[in-house]
Interface confidence: medium
């Protein structure tokens, strides 16, 4: 499921460093929806893409996102054996050459056209949450997650135990 030995050897040597420029371990094409089953959709408007969170009509086709998985080290300044804190990171691309980016200054999630190697703002730590959901934590800003705010994706800071399991940062991935 995820793992190509050559890539593993490459990523295993990394510790507290960028993973950009490295080939993904595996890729997965899926539709992205919220905990409450609203779909994440992408629309081209005035030569740029907008991201929406909306209820689809019954037979409306869901937009797909290509998730590219990478394995990296949990950034750490602790003493260790160099393999402590392996984690999965993902990039999310709804269409060729465009990736979701975290804009930490504006607390927004945007679609940017860019070439590889991708910037760190395009990488999100994947958390395997309860109820078959996932959450996406910014690589560049630990504790900040992709979430839903006013029918748009936004960056939401999770700084207390009440916040994290709130539904607005939980997402479902589906092949259909």
């Amino acid at each position: 499921a995820f793992g190509i030995s050559g890539v593993q050897k490459y990523t295993r040597a990394l510790h507290d460093s960028s993973i950009t420029g490295i080939s993904p371990i595996t890729e997965y094409l899926a539709s992205l929806s919220t905990y409450n089953d609203q779909s994440i959709t992408f629309a081209l408007e005035d030569e740029s893409y907008e991201i929406y969170v909306e209820d689809l009509k019954k037979d409306e086709k869901k937009d797909k996102v290509l998730l590219s998985y990478y394995e990296s080290q949990h950034p750490s300044n602790e003493s260790g054996d160099g393999v402590d804190g392996k984690m999965l990171m993902v990039t999310l691309s709804p269409t060729k050459d465009f990736w979701l980016h975290a804009n930490n200054k504006e607390h927004s999630v945007e679609l940017h056209k860019c070439e590889k190697p991708l910037p760190d703002q395009a990488f999100f730590v994947l958390h395997n949450m309860h109820s078959n959901c996932v959450s996406f934590e910014c690589k560049t800003d630990p504790g900040v997650f992709i979430g839903v705010k006013d029918n748009h994706l936004a960056l939401i800071k999770v700084d207390s135990s009440e916040n994290l399991c709130t539904e607005n940062i939980l997402f479902k991935l589906s092949e259909t």
């Epitope: 402590d84 999965l88 958390h127």
Partner: antibody, heavy 122, light 111 residues
Framework: EVQLVESGGGLVQPGGSLRLSCATS????????MNWVRQAPGKGLEWVGF??????????EYSASVKGRFTISRDNSKSILYLQMNSLRAEDTAVYYC?????????????WGQGTLVTVSS | EIVLTQSPATLSLSPGERATLSCRAS??????????MNWYQQKPGQAPRLLIY???NQGSGIPARFSGSGSGTDFTLTISSLEPEDFAVYYC?????????FGGGTKVEIK
């Protein structure tokens, strides 16, 4: 270096209680889900439960066989994991291990303690 | 809960031979492109040792002779050429969902 050291095992009568400890070092304790896994003598491995990390509110999950009788807790100031076992039964006799995943709750465990033996017998 | 069935229960082989261990899940352990199936080795009196995680990834410091494959419900652990230290019990474990579950184990013994 990541270290996990269990203690607190021993002989206890059916219906009795026992508290196991898992002292940890070498990592930021609050960042990690922490698990208990047990193994009855000559038998296979059984997951007991886990306690989530700080960002997930330190909430817990248990296997059906121990739910309502066992409680997992943690002392984050001391980096110690606990397993409080009440209403013990003969079938709870096992070596109890604490285990830590690489990160988050992906659920695979490269780090294990040496185990502590709990014997429930009259 | 997801039930894992390992086969065979016992595998009698000689050093240098190839070992193929099977684990079958009662339902798929795949989720968002990852197979949440893991393999451990355990020797008497020792804690389990993670060999393979997410179906095919080697744990840290695990020799290259150990490999994992499979997806969905059927998984295989292969030891390409058995070394004397490989004779032990091997467990599969799913971590797709709580409760995490383990297979009953396969004992690899010297023929």
């Amino acid at each position: 270096e990541v270290q996990l050291v269990e203690s607190g095992g021993g002989l206890v009568q059916p219906g009795g209680s026992l508290r196991l400890s898992c002292a940890t070092s070498g990592f930021t304790f609050t960042d990690y889900y922490m698990n208990w896994v047990r193994q009855a003598p000559g038998k296979g491995l059984e997951w007991v439960g886990f306690i989530r990390n700080k960002v997930n509110g330190y909430t817990t999950e248990y296997s059906a066989s121990v739910k309502g009788r066992f409680t997992i807790s943690r002392d984050n100031s001391k980096s110690i994991l606990y397993l409080q076992m009440n209403s013990l039964r003969a079938e709870d006799t096992a070596v109890y291990y604490c285990a830590r995943p690489y990160y988050g709750n992906y659920g695979w465990f490269p780090y294990w303690g040496q185990g502590t033996l709990v014997t429930v017998s009259s | 809960e997801i039930v894992l069935t390992q086969s065979p229960a016992t595998l009698s082989l000689s050093p240098g031979e190839r070992a193929t261990l099977s684990c079958r899940a009662s339902e798929s352990v795949d989720n968002y492109g990852i197979s949440f199936m893991n393999w451990y080795q355990q020797k008497p009196g020792q804690a389990p040792r993670l060999l393979i995680y997410a179906a095919s990834n080697q744990g840290s410091g695990i020799p290259a002779r150990f490999s994992g494959s499979g997806s969905g419900t059927d998984f295989t652990l292969t030891i390409s050429s058995l070394e004397p230290e490989d004779f032990a019990v091997y467990y599969c474990q799913q971590s797709k969902e709580v409760p995490y579950t383990f297979g009953g184990g396969t004992k690899v013994e010297i023929k």
